[in-house]
Interface confidence: low
């Protein structure tokens, strides 16, 4: 789990001074002047460091009070329509940080597994109430990773309007049910997204050029389930020019055979397909229409799987997925506990990476590092991981460029600006930029070779398979080649 990994920072940089307002204009509907920040990182080519230096020097020279920090906080807004609620009937909501000069809106769907029966929802309510109720939500949240307004932490979209939508529906953002006699809980994930979009139109979203619906884990799957519906909603409300795109992080799951089969008792060990099958009925779950029409009644669970729903989507979607995703391994009962693993488990894990890689073959915009981890885009050091020399923010920038205004990923990738980035090396952490691993018990950092040997990886056997000297293989592992 989480205790095993930390993120490596590639050299701490000082926080940037706040950017000065560049021009003033009237905010729609208010007559009040608003600050506008026309600098836009996604349009920057070439040397990012040099550009950053220019921005900083410009900011410091124009902004005498540079000790003041930009307020990083997103502020809580509970939905005005209080009939759209969390599991326990408390109003759902969103956290917002506006950026008046920007026509980009990032809506992030939080993750956090799910529950699919009265019993395991009761248990979830006892232990993880924040994921089922808004009663104890803080008034503010700090934007991190792709939700950060600091250019160093978020070179991709630091200037966007940031929206964090807390997950409190436990339904993978699919539910459209209301309180009834037989249901203690309500499941309104899909309705929450719809209502948040509706309310944001009155807070400036109406002027957006691009809406990026992003999410991690269950939120990543939520993106796949809802992105087309959001586009449709905006078209119906008379905003067809807003370009809706998706960014699904760690939500691309496989219906592969479990490493060890278990009965469907609790959320974590129940095979995902069975959990979702039960969940859809319990939640009154909705899946995208075009996907649903491809499966017969009762088989809608297929549309929760990225590789099955993706080909039916109209909106462009960028898929981010660790090849060795911890949630997938947990659901497959193959997670690495810190104990040495048997050969069968190694083969299973390697095969998982291979299968996942295959499902991403026809996904033009994808970023899949060969790491054992879960979630990335709202981690502060999300910029550190690279695939084939390209970081995720850079890949997203290239994706923006490839889309231009056409809403379709172009067939020929832009020169020097790749968007299909899937690691080809075959085992966990064969990519040297993976999040650093720590021994679960000692807290000691491990390099790739140490980690693999600690997990029972047989250097001798693998070297033989690859036709290499064991020492050469160890060298390759340590350097990540």
């Amino acid at each position: 789990g989480e205790g095993r990994k930390t993120w490596r920072r590639r050299g701490q940089q000082p926080a940037p001074a706040p950017l000065p307002p560049q021009r003033t204009e009237a905010a729609p509907g208010t007559g009040q002047p608003v600050e506008s920040f026309p600098l836009d990182f996604t349009a920057v080519e070439g040397n990012m460091d040099s550009f950053m230096a220019q921005v900083k020097s410009l900011a410091q020279s124009l902004y005498p009070c540079s000790a003041q920090q930009l307020n990083e906080d997103l502020r809580l807004h509970l939905l005005l329509n209080t009939s759209v609620t969390c599991n326990d009937g408390s109003p759902a909501g969103y956290y917002l940080k506006e950026s008046k000069g920007s026509r980009r809106w990032l809506l992030f769907l939080e993750g956090g597994w799910y529950c699919f029966s009265r019993e395991n929802c009761d248990s979830r309510y006892d232990t993880m109430r924040r994921l089922m109720s808004s009663k104890d939500w803080p008034q503010t949240r700090t934007g991190t990773g792709i939700l950060s307004s600091q250019p160093e932490e978020n070179p991709y979209w630091w200037n966007a309007n940031m929206v964090f939508i807390p997950y409190c529906s436990s339904d993978v953002w699919s539910g459209a049910s209301s309180k009834s006699e037989k249901n203690e809980y309500v499941f309104m994930g899909a309705l929450i997204i719809r209502e948040v979009v509706q309310e944001l139109l009155g807070r400036g979203l109406s002027g957006a050029k691009v809406l990026l619906l992003a999410g991690s884990s269950a939120g990543g799957t939520g993106v796949l389930l809802n992105v087309d519906r959001v586009a449709e909603q905006l078209e119906q409300l008379g905003y067809p020019a807003i370009q809706v795109r998706g960014l699904a992080d760690s939500g691309w799951f496989l219906d592969n055979k479990q490493y060890r089969r278990t009965d469907c008792v609790d959320t974590v060990t129940c095979a995902p397909t069975e959990a979702i099958r039960r969940g859809i009925r319990y939640w009154n779950g909705m899946v995208p229409e075009r996907c649903r029409s491809q499966f017969k009644e009762g088989e809608e669970w297929n549309c929760f799987l990225g590789y099955k729903v993706y080909p039916t989507l109209r909106c462009p979607v960028f898929v981010v997925q660790w090849l060795f995703d911890e949630a997938q391994l947990t659901a497959d009962n193959a997670h690495l506990t810190g104990q040495p693993v048997q050969e069968g488990q190694w083969l299973y894990i390697q095969n998982l990476g291979h299968e996942l890689r295959n499902t991403l073959k026809d996904v033009p915009a994808s970023f899949a590092p060969a790491c054992l981890s879960h979630e990335i885009i709202i981690r502060s050091h999300w910029t550190d991981v690279q695939v084939k020399g390209t970081s995720l923010p850079r890949a997203l920038h290239c994706w923006d460029r490839s889309l231009h205004d056409s809403h379709k990923a172009s067939k020929t990738p832009l020169k020097g600006c790749p968007i299909h980035l899937v690691d080809s090396c075959p085992w966990p952490h064969c990519n040297p930029s993976c999040p650093t691993i720590r021994d679960q018990f000692t807290g000691q950092e491990m390099n790739v070779a140490q980690f693999l040997m600690h997990m029972g990886f047989d250097v001798q056997t693998v070297a033989q398979q690859q036709g290499l000297e064991p020492s050469k293989l160890l060298g390759m592992l340590s350097s990540g080649s």
Epitope: P28, G29, G31, L80, R103, Q198, E199, L201, G202, R203, G204, S206, G207, A208, K209, E235, Q236, L237, G238, Y239, P240, A241, Q243, H404, D405, S406, H407
Partner: antibody, heavy 119, light 111 residues
Amino acid sequence: EVQLVESGGGLVKPGGSLKLSCAASGFTFSDYGMHWFRQAPEKGLEWVAYISSGSRTVYYADTVKGRFTISRDNAKNTLSLQMTSLRSEDTAMYYCARKHYNGGYFDVWGTGTTVTVSS
Amino acid sequence: DIVLTQSPASLAVSLGQRATISCRASKIVSTSGYSYMHWYQQKPGQPPKLLIYLASNLESGVPARFSGSGSGTDFTLNIHPVEEEDAATYYCQHSRELPPTFGSGTKLEIK
């Protein structure tokens, strides 16, 4: 200077066809949704068609659906309206207009081109 | 479609006085603090010109004697003090949904 200039109007017989063009200059054309409107002599303004900035979405008024086609070429900064099966009630001054991206109002209008459908 | 009813159809106002034009929508065109109603001026032989957007915001370059107000379904355009050059037809337009529709127009004459 931000400008829209229509062309292609003229006299045409009922059932005939005509293609109107609108040349944009002075702004980033590809950033904006564009609309066609018309105004019959001594009458009010009527919306005809809409095309989104990247041509992904098009909408038509019921009165022209199936007969008119809106298109755009962002590389050439031009908007077009192909009109077929013209009727006498299509006689009007045709305007292209730029939809402001915030709020759906029209902040730039062309000077108009006249279409007369008569036998 | 949303129907916009403008009144009066025409009015004559003395130079320097106030002109008030009303526009009523067949359904609410405001949501979450924004009112999707706009006002245009059109002179003979010319295209419409945007005056007021989102109910009350003055378009750049438009004289401050023009002002807009209202929310929900009822909106008003005021011109004060009226000047000679304000003789024109005025239209309201909503953008709450597609299709955008216009009022039938109010013709302003200067006495």
